[in-house]
């Protein structure tokens, strides 16, 4: 089970619930976006394949002072089995292009919705 205690309940959260909550948070970010998200900050795009959650966290954790994505950063840390620090990039994370945080969130959301529909909760 993905352990995400503290988000919806005090104990371990089923992976399907954790993924649904992450999707809901990303939807919330995209719908409530008035000004450019995180002041137009640019982050490394990621491969939406194996190790996606850690890669997404490695990318977004570098953005500081952006309250809009703080909850997403915390949620992603629950999906990633190792501790991630700013400036840390795993060998799986190929740095080839930077995109705005808003585009990053949209791309991630589309992919997570697809995974949810297909029942891939881990």
């Amino acid at each position: 089970l993905t352990c995400l205690g503290g988000f919806a309940s005090p104990g371990p959260v089923p992976p399907s619930t954790a993924l649904r909550e992450l999707i809901e948070e990303l939807v919330n970010i995209t719908q409530n976006q008035k000004a450019p998200l995180c002041n137009g900050s640019m982050v490394w795009s990621i491969n939406l394949t194996a190790g996606m959650y850690c890669a997404a966290l490695e990318s977004l954790i570098n953005v500081s002072g952006c309250s809009a994505i703080e909850k997403t950063q915390r949620m992603l840390s629950g999906f990633c089995p190792h501790k991630v620090s700013a400036g840390q990039f795993s060998s799986l994370h190929v740095r080839d292009t930077k995109i705005e945080v808003a585009q990053f969130v949209k791309d991630l959301l589309l992919h997570l919705k697809k995974l949810f529909r297909e029942g891939q909760f881990n």
Epitope: P36, C38, N39, V43, N62, V63, S64, G65
Partner: nanobody
């Protein structure tokens, strides 16, 4: 207070060259990853290039790879972008940016116009 001041833009013919500079102050420059970002008229932001704090690692957008070179002089707190073989599609306002901070820490930009 973080300040970034770009310079070096101008009008250049296709195939020509320009060197952009960005003077940084108000933060520990040699600890920060730095970006060049551009915005073409009526378009969104486009990432151009990134350089690591030491300057040893560099990354480029496919659209500029092999033509642009990013560099930095940490002793002068200055970031550079050498632009060669310029094309009309490179016309844009170029901004230097402290990575991951967004435009609250950008300078006013420098306009590069590539036209014959």
């Amino acid at each position: 207070e973080v300040q970034l001041l770009e310079s070096g833009g101008g009008l250049v013919q296709p195939g020509g060259s320009l060197r952009l500079s960005c003077a940084a102050s108000g933060f520990t420059f040699d600890r920060e990853e730095m970006d060049w970002v551009r915005q073409a008229p009526g378009k969104g932001l486009e990432w151009v290039s990134t350089i690591s704090p030491s300057g040893r690692k560099t990354w480029y957008a496919d659209s500029v790879k092999g033509r642009f070179t990013i560099s930095r002089d940490n002793s002068k707190n200055t970031l550079y972008l050498q632009m060669n073989s310029l094309r009309a599609k490179d016309t844009a306002v170029y901004y230097c940016a402290k990575a991951y901070t967004g435009f609250r820490y950008w300078g006013q930009g420098t306009l590069v116009t590539v036209s014959s």
